[in-house]
Amino acid sequence: IWELKKDVYVVELDWYPDAPGEMVVLTCDTPEEDGITWTLDQSSEVLGSGKTLTIQVKEFGDAGQYTCHKGGEVLSHSLLLLHKKEDGIWSTDILKDQKEPKNKTFLRCEAKNYSGRFTCWWLTTISTDLTFSVKSSRGSSDPQGVTCGAATLSAERVRGDNKEYEYSVECQEDSACPAAEESLPIEVMVDAVHKLKYENYTSSFFIRDIIKPDPPKNLQLKPLKNSRQVEVSWEYPDTWSTPHSYFSLTFCVQVQGKSKREKKDRVFTDKTSATVICRKNASISVRAQDRYYSSSWSEWASVPCS
């Protein structure tokens, strides 16, 4: 058993049929010695008396808020949560496996630039009685500070008959150095509590590996005289790291017909313009990627040829 936060404790249980469970001793936080009784949740049934209560925790029915009282007055509370271990593996019932970039990916993180600010998100089908708390650091043995905000419901999507909820959190490395080579990874730890179930999820990454620029901005077409060709121009996104001479992007320009089956013409360039043939009813799209490190491409910015 360990303390998650004040008056909230996590009991770690090997979860299999007829498991013996864990013996837990609760102590009432009071100078009183006599006349103390204990109850669980909303029940008025007295579970025991005295300053300590010893219980055998085997299942979710044994978890919950234990309260010690004296003469009708509440003295203190202890909330017990369960963390299940099945076949030596901690349960991952609360979050959905996003399966990208690999199986057992519960947390996904992205950064728009090298400023040390990043966003992580996760998915669940659970809509109520759910809380998250997030901690992060650079390295684990001698951790350097990363400050994270509160996890917030950020999207809701229908998947078949179910609703899927996405939660996001923003974090900022306290002393980020955008141009420095990273040697220690960022660690992100998420505590998830659903009703009386506790789970924890972790992710470890370098900022350089989670970079995904915003799409190029101000995408414009300029027709070339007496030609089907157009000059496409764009700018670096506002959110990209500066100076651009050091933090450089490369771009992919794509001409896509109305039908997805039509052949796509693609041009790659380090410049912020390109000349392409604009077909009728086609659209021109541009996306960006770090020029010197193959992290993710941005989403596409698009304009119609017409």
Epitope: K112, G149, L153, S154, E156, S168, E170, T239
Partner: nanobody, 115 residues
Framework: EVQLVESGGGLVQPGGSLRLSCAAS????????MYWVRQAPGKELEWVST????????RYADSVKGRFTISRDNAKNTLYLQMNSLKPEDTSLYYC????????RGQGTQVTVSS
């Protein structure tokens, strides 16, 4: 008292653009994640987009991704939704909201996409 006042809706042809605005007051706007939701006649309220309090994180429904852009100006307490390449199926009453479920939302602004 929390107030959210949307504007910028109107009638537009398919492929056209509109920019919606939402003026917020009565709460600390710069501390709040904000949302756009919409409701078509006879349909359920639908989440469209989300932006974090800093503006760094944005999220979009699959149906609008690549066409709509959410942004905010914390100095002006204003939320925006730039809508490009509009389609007839985007026709809805659009609300800005302080929660994704739309319980804390404004009166809405009507967007009609029709030729």
């Amino acid at each position: 008292e929390v107030q959210l006042v949307e504007s910028g809706g109107g009638l537009v042809q398919p492929g056209g653009s509109l920019r919606l605005s939402c003026a917020a007051s009565g709460f600390t706007f710069s501390d709040s994640w904000m949302y756009w939701v919409r409701q078509a006649p006879g349909k359920e309220l639908e989440w469209v987009s989300t932006i974090s309090n800093s503006g760094f994180t944005t999220r979009y429904a699959d149906s609008v991704k690549g066409r709509f852009t959410i942004s905010r100006d914390n100095a002006k307490n204003t939320l925006y939704l730039q809508m490009n390449s509009l389609k007839p199926e985007d026709t809805s009453l659009y609300y800005c909201a302080r929660d994704l479920g739309g319980a804390l939302r404004g009166q809405g602004t009507q967007v009609t996409v029709s030729s």
